[in-house]
Interface confidence: low
Amino acid sequence: ILGGREAEAHARPYMASVQVNGEHLCGGVLVAEQWVLSAAHCLEDAADGKVQVLLGAHSLSQPEPSKRLYDVLRAVPHPDSRPDTIDHDLLLLQLSEKATLGPAVRPLPWQRVDRDVEPGTLCDVAGWGIVSHAGRRPDRLQHVLLPVLDRATCNRRTHHDGAITQRMMCAESNRRDSCKGDSGGPLVCGGVLEGVVTSGSRVCGNRKKPGIYTRVASYAAWIDSVLA
C-alpha cells in the first residue's frame, strides 16, 4: 500500500495473507468459514511452492494469539482467467478446515448486486504489499482510503485505454494506491467487499494509472457455485 498508514490491529478480521513457502505473496479476504477469495494470477507466482493462508494476523513476523496458518485443500481459479489478461482475476482457496472464528477472524459480506459503486465513494484497501517504490515490504498490515473513479475516466487513452471492463472498477491512484503484494486483497466500500485487487504489473501511485479491482458482484454466480 502506497501512501497509506498502519491499520488498526485486527480491525479487519477478514484480511488474509496468501503465503508460499512461508512468505507473503498476495492478499486475500475471508468470504466464508472455509474459503478465502484472492486473485488468480497469484497462483502463477506460486510455482510449485506450498500455498497456505494466514488468518488473524496484524504482524507477519510477530507471534499473535489470533494468528493461524491454514493449509489449502483446494485452489479454484476462475475458469476464464488467463495469464495474459487481468480479466476474471479471481481465485477461491478452500482451507483445510473451517477457520476458527473470533474477534480477529471473521468473513466479510460481499456485494451481490451487480451495480457499480458510485464514483467518488471512499473505499478501504488493505494489504502487506510494498510501501515504497524501492520495494520496501511492511511487517504490519497497511491500509488506505481511495475514491472510486468512474470507468469512463479510467478507460481514457491516457489512463487504461479501454481495458477496464464492466467486471472491473477503478480507484484513484494519486500517490495513494495498492501495489505489488496487495493483489488479491479486498476493496471494501461501506463495510461490504466490492472489489479484489488485480494482480497485473501496473505502475503504482501514478494518477494516470488508476488501481484496477475485480468487481465481486459480477461473479456472484461463480462464487456461489464454488462455495456450494
Epitope: I86, R112, R115, D116, P119, R151, G162, T165, Q166
Partner: antibody, heavy 122, light 107 residues
C-alpha cells in the same frame, strides 16, 4: 452510427462447425464487450458468452462453453463465434450484440447485429 | 442460473389501450431487469434497463416497474407499431438470462 454487420446464412451438416462474423463500425471496437445470443423458437433468447475486444478475455455460459469459441480481430473490428459439433438443436438465429453501460454499470444489450441464420441439416 | 418467466405467451389489446406485460425472476434480482422489443423480421431493441430507466429514444408511453422477483412493462396507450415480441432480461449476474417472450397482438 453504431452498426454490427453479420455474415450470411449458413447451411451445415450435423457434426460440423460454423464460424460467424460480426463487423463493428461507428464506435471504438475495444470499448465494449461483444456478446453472442442464440434465438430459437423453442428456447427464446439465450446468452452464449461475451468477449472483451481489448484483451481477448472471454466469459461463457456454461451451457455453451464446451462448443463455442469467441475471438476478435482488432485490426478489422470484427468479432467471431465458432460453434462446433453441431446438431439440429443448434438451428437458430445467432446475434452479436454490444453491451450497454449506464452510470458505468452493464445494463443490457444496446446494439444488435441483423442476425445470422444457421440451419443444421443432413 | 436465474430463470426469467413470462407467464403470458400472447396478449391481445386494442390501439389506445393500456397493457402490462409481466416477468418473474427465480430469485431476487434487485431491480436489475431490462426489457426488449422485437418486431417481425428485426433484431431486438433495448427499451428499458434498471427496471424503469428508458433507453435513448424510447417513447414515454413505455414504463417499467417492479422489485424483488416481480417486474412489469407497461404501455400506457398502445399504438399499432407496438405489435411485437417483448422480452425481459436480468442483468443482475452472469449468465445473463431472458424470459420466453410475450407476443403483443393488436385486435
Amino acid at each position: 452510427e453504431v452498426q454490427l454487420q453479420q455474415s450470411g446464412p449458413e447451411l451445415v451438416k450435423p457434426g460440423a462447425s460454423v464460424k460467424i462474423s460480426c463487423k463493428a463500425s461507428g464506435y471504438s471496437f475495444t470499448a465494449y464487450y461483444m456478446n453472442w445470443v442464440k434465438h430459437s423458437p423453442e428456447k427464446s433468447l439465450e446468452w452464449i458468452g461475451d468477449i472483451n475486444p481489448s484483451t481477448g478475455g472471454t466469459t461463457y455460459n456454461q451451457k455453451f462453453k464446451a462448443r463455442a469459441t469467441l475471438t476478435v480481430d482488432k485490426s478489422s473490428s470484427t468479432a467471431y463465434m465458432q460453434l462446433k459439433s453441431l446438431t439440429s438443436e443448434d438451428s437458430a438465429v445467432y446475434y452479436c450484440a454490444t453491451t450497454y453501460y449506464s452510470g458505468n454499470s452493464y445494463v443490457g444489450f444496446a446494439y444488435w447485429g441483423q442476425g445470422t441464420l444457421v440451419t443444421v441439416s443432413a | 442460473d436465474i430463470v426469467m418467466t413470462q407467464s403470458h405467451k400472447f396478449m391481445s389489446t386494442s390501439v389506445g389501450d393500456r397493457v402490462s406485460i409481466t416477468c418473474k425472476a427465480s430469485q431476487d434480482v434487485s431491480t436489475a431487469v431490462a426489457w426488449y422489443q422485437q418486431k417481425p423480421g428485426q433484431s431486438p431493441k433495448l427499451l428499458i434497463f434498471w427496471t424503469s430507466t428508458r433507453h435513448t429514444g424510447v417513447p414515454d408511453r413505455f414504463t417499467g416497474s417492479g422489485s424483488g422477483t416481480d417486474y412489469t412493462l407497461t404501455i400506457s396507450s398502445v399504438q399499432a407499431e407496438d405489435l411485437a415480441l417483448y422480452y425481459c432480461q436480468q442483468h443482475y449476474t452472469t449468465p445473463w438470462t431472458f424470459g420466453g417472450g410475450t407476443k403483443l397482438e393488436i385486435k
